[in-house]
């Protein structure tokens, strides 16, 4: 068998809502994956499991089952959404995300995804990890790979 390639493309969109009373942030993050089948036979994408971390704390998980079939030498782009919640001991981020005096409301999240594929009764798991920027201050739609992680520092003005 030839390889099945999984490429994490990036964050497609992030939709944010808040609970002011609970100082809680809800982020629905839609990610894009490219899955390429380099074989001369079809493979089944059985499931995609994903989780999102902020500062080493898991803030969201998702699992998609019976997703699609990828034909021989074909590629499919798959979007999946992870609902995340930043609350409790992380609720200081509520202020960072909502204060108008802060001009940039990006946070760095670690996206982890595992794709399980199957062919001829054989299962294979491929995992990817990527740090991404997500805007927690407004609803955002991203160009692909626009949310890649870099690092610069400045104080709140």
């Amino acid at each position: 068998p030839r390889s099945i390639e999984v490429k994490y493309i990036g964050v497609k969109s992030a939709y944010v809502s808040y609970d002011a009373e609970k100082r809680t942030i809800y982020l629905n993050i839609t990610n894009t994956l490219n899955i390429t089948n380099n074989n001369y036979y079809s493979v089944e994408v059985e499931n995609i499991t994903a989780q999102v971390q902020f500062s080493k704390t898991v803030i969201g998980k998702a699992r998609l089952n019976n997703i699609t079939n990828i034909g021989p030498l074909d590629m499919k782009q798959i979007d999946y959404t992870v609902p995340t919640v930043i609350a409790e001991e992380m609720s200081y981020m509520y202020d960072f995300c909502t204060l108008l005096s802060i001009k940039v409301h990006n946070i760095v999240l670690m996206m982890q995804v595992t794709v399980t594929t199957a062919y001829f009764g054989h299962s294979e798991q491929i995992s990817q990890e990527r740090y991404q920027y997500v805007d927690c201050g407004r609803n955002t739609t991203y160009q692909l790979a626009q949310s890649e992680y870099l690092n610069v520092l400045q104080p709140q003005q």
């Epitope: 002011a20 992680y149 520092l153």
Partner: antibody, heavy 125, light 107 residues
Framework: EVQLQQSGPELVKPGASVKIPCKAS????????MDWVKQSPGKSLEWIGH????????FYNQKFKGKATLTVDKSSSTAYMELRSLTSEDSAVYYC??????????????????WGQGTSVTVSS | DVQITQSPSYLAASPGETITINCRAS??????LAWYQEKPGKTNKLLIY???TLQSGIPSRFSGSGSGTDFTLTISSLEPEDFAMYYC?????????FGGGTKLEIK
């Protein structure tokens, strides 16, 4: 110049309440959140909680829930902390401190960049 | 809650010397640690934030390092005005917690 002005020492009776003001000047009051910190005699610092002056939203250290109440008066740029049902355990110096968020492309952390001079509270009959 | 163990609690040194103060967190706090200086009759001063970034206006003889669970404040070439109380504070998760403090005195 950023300043956080706190009131003078307070001597209060057990079971009573006290309300400590923290008047902010030199910056836009609603641009930053305010934290409160306790320092008992000969001890380290304990974080009490924090308030966002924009909406009055608060988050408390579980240990101080029911003991401390944080409020703000935007018109006078003043933050307040009320301590109730006072006991000798509440005798301490209480500080207000401005919380600043650091960011560039993204969130990079925060700190208490300006502190009040502290208000000493003594609980005694 | 994240426990912060600060050491030593007391330190005697002479002007011109270099000293280090350590803080250890009970779990990973990434880089989210700040250092403060406390002096009688003065308001507390922020020295270092995000583990290693020097606050504006603080002399470069102060430096911070570390991430995860272990952090260090270094003061090189001590000046007379550096003799004070020092505290570290984690801000990775609520409730914020402080180290027990280090009293730096003149030898």
């Amino acid at each position: 110049e950023v300043q956080l002005q706190q009131s003078g020492p307070e001597l209060v009776k057990p079971g009573a309440s006290v309300k400590i003001p923290c008047k902010a000047s030199g910056y836009t009051f609603t641009d930053y959140t305010m934290d409160w910190v306790k320092q008992s005699p000969g001890k380290s610092l304990e974080w009490i909680g924090h308030i966002n002056p924009n909406d009055g939203g608060t988050f408390y250290n579980q240990k101080f829930k029911g003991k401390a109440t944080l409020t703000v008066d935007k018109s006078s740029s003043t933050a307040y902390m009320e301590l109730r049902s006072l006991t000798s355990e509440d005798s301490a110096v209480y500080y207000c401190a401005r919380w600043v968020y650091y960011y560039g492309i993204s969130y990079e952390g925060g700190a208490m960049d300006y502190w009040g001079q502290g208000t000493s509270v003594t609980v005694s009959s | 809650d994240v426990q912060i163990t600060q050491s030593p609690s007391y330190l005697a040194a002479s002007p011109g010397e270099t000293i280090t103060i350590n803080c250890r967190a009970s779990k990973s706090i990434s880089k989210y640690l700040a250092w403060y200086q406390e002096k009688p009759g003065k308001t507390n001063k922020l020295l270092i934030y995000s583990g290693s970034t020097l606050q504006s206006g603080i002399p470069s003889r102060f430096s911070g390092s570390g991430s995860g669970t272990d952090f260090t404040l270094t003061i090189s070439s001590l000046e007379p005005e550096d003799f004070a109380m020092y505290y570290c504070q984690q801000h990775n998760e609520y409730p914020w917690t402080f180290g027990g403090g280090t009293k730096l005195e003149i030898k």
